[in-house]
């Protein structure tokens, strides 16, 4: 990722910039953007970044708001890299079974599952 | 989802079935399946279920192992439904900004980010 700061620091900085520029971002009162209904955020990264693209195209650029969108695009690069790592390594069934057990365990304990 | 039990109970039952049928599942020693390198599971649902499909096609069916794969296909249906809900609702920028802040906050605290 072409960034000099670690991804974790990048996310923190982006959160701060989002707060700073909130008023400017929400200025367009007619614009509508898809917002996921649930909180399983990782399932929705594609839609979230499409929404960011829509927002960027409608926001007056300049100053640190540009930095916000630059950061968001670096975060997208990081997530795309993580997605690539989902399917790159072909392992034995043994390891896949262990991973599947972990995945289901996480679904069981951490996912927000509607009844 | 065409299932009489809630998704959370379905996941628990599937975890138990996975343990029960482990020996049968790992019998194929030559089969290789993509295993994600990281633990951001929700980013990898597509690859995980492709792997499950590969495993199912190579596993002798019958008895409760069929129930395992049936359950996994119901879990996939649930996740596909969640994915659909990522982009169905078009909201104002205000709500999108709130969701983006939440997404970045979750990334900051809960995601497994490599340094």
């Amino acid at each position: 990722i072409p960034t000099e700061i670690p991804t974790s620091a990048l996310v923190k900085e982006t959160l701060a910039l989002l707060s700073t520029h909130r008023t400017l971002l929400i200025a367009n009162e007619t614009l509508r953007i898809p917002v996921p209904v649930h909180k399983n955020h990782q399932l929705c990264t594609e839609e979230i970044f499409q929404g960011i693209g829509t927002l960027e195209s409608q926001t007056v650029q300049g100053g640190t708001v540009e930095r916000l969108f630059k950061n968001l695009s670096l975060i997208k690069k990081y997530i795309d890299g993580q997605k690539k790592k989902c399917g790159e390594e072909r392992r034995r069934v043994n390891q896949f079974a262990d991973y599947l057990q972990e995945f289901l365990g996480v679904m069981n304990t951490e996912w927000i599952i509607e009844s | 989802i065409p299932t009489e039990i809630p998704t959370s109970a379905l996941v628990k039952e599937t975890l138990a079935l996975l343990s029960t049928h482990r020996t049968l599942l790992i019998a194929n020693e030559t089969l290789r399946i993509p295993v994600p390198v990281h633990k951001n599971h929700q980013l990898c649902t597509e690859e995980i279920f492709q792997g499950i499909g590969t495993l199912e096609s190579q596993t002798v069916q019958g008895g409760t192992v069929e129930r395992l794969f049936k359950n996994l296909s119901l879990i996939k249906k649930y996740i596909d439904g969640q994915k659909k809900k990522c982009g169905e609702e078009r909201r104002r920028v205000n709500q999108f900004a709130d969701y983006l802040q939440e997404f970045l906050g979750v990334m900051n605290t809960e995601w497994i980010i490599e340094s």
Partner: antibody, heavy 119, light 107 residues
């Protein structure tokens, strides 16, 4: 920086048990599997098993199954390896090692713990 | 279990020499092999993973190659600090297994 710090040397009698600890720091403990490897004096390396701190799931080398128990304490970011029914051939240096990713190479090793089994 | 056969078990070489160590797996392990260096009384240190990927901070004189069953570790120009024992490790299947080691000694 990322570190695995193991407990000190132990001397045990045959038939006893030993519990070796491995304290992780510098990273999120639940993100990486912890493997245990041993090395008898003048011998090579032997994999005992791994534990996934994310879900407490462990997997053992069949050779150690029933005698080795891998556990973690998430609150202190510590992994443990307990070996029971000790015999003289269990005299070895025991290492913990972190998986870089799921079922991946060992990117960080502990300094080792010498366990001596002697009557 | 997958057997890992390393050769030679020991070798004598001089500073500046090119050294090659081989490792043969009893079955196909794809490229899930790492090379580990251990100095006397010290903890092991991984040098190479996935057969040919050098770990950050490891000098470029170390290189790995191979896939399937046959693997090689090469030290292009041996340095004084390279005198140690080298192990291969397959992490393709459980139980993970190591080669018996190759001791690189000063000639």
């Amino acid at each position: 920086q990322v570190q695995l710090v193991q407990s000190g040397a132990e001397v045990k009698k045959p038939g006893a048990s030993v519990k070796v600890s491995c304290k992780a720091s510098g990273y999120t403990f639940t993100n990486h599997h912890i493997n245990w490897v041993r090395q008898a004096p003048g011998q090579g390396l032997e994999w005992i098993g791994y534990i996934n701190p994310y879900n407490d799931y462990s997997r053992y080398n069949q050779k150690f199954k029933g005698r080795a128990t891998l556990t973690v304490d998430k609150s202190t970011s510590t992994a443990y390896m307990e070996l029971s029914s000790l015999r003289s051939e269990d005299t070895a240096v025991y290492y913990c090692a972190r998986d870089y990713g799921n079922f991946w190479y060992f990117d960080v090793w502990g300094q080792g713990t010498l366990v001596t089994v002697s009557s | 279990d997958i057997q890992m056969t390393q050769s030679p078990s020991s070798l004598s070489a001089s500073v500046g020499d090119r050294v090659t160590i081989t490792c043969k797996a009893s079955q196909d392990i794809n490229s899930y092999l790492s090379w580990i260096q251990q100095k006397p009384g010290k903890a092991p240190k991984t040098l190479i993973h996935r057969a040919d990927r050098l770990i950050d901070g490891v000098p470029s004189r170390f290189s790995g190659s191979g896939s399937g069953q046959d693997f090689t570790l090469t030290i292009s120009s041996l340095q004084p600090e390279d005198f140690a024992t080298y192990y291969c490790l397959q992490y393709d299947d459980f139980p993970y297994t190591f080669g018996q080691g190759t001791k690189v000694e000063i000639k």
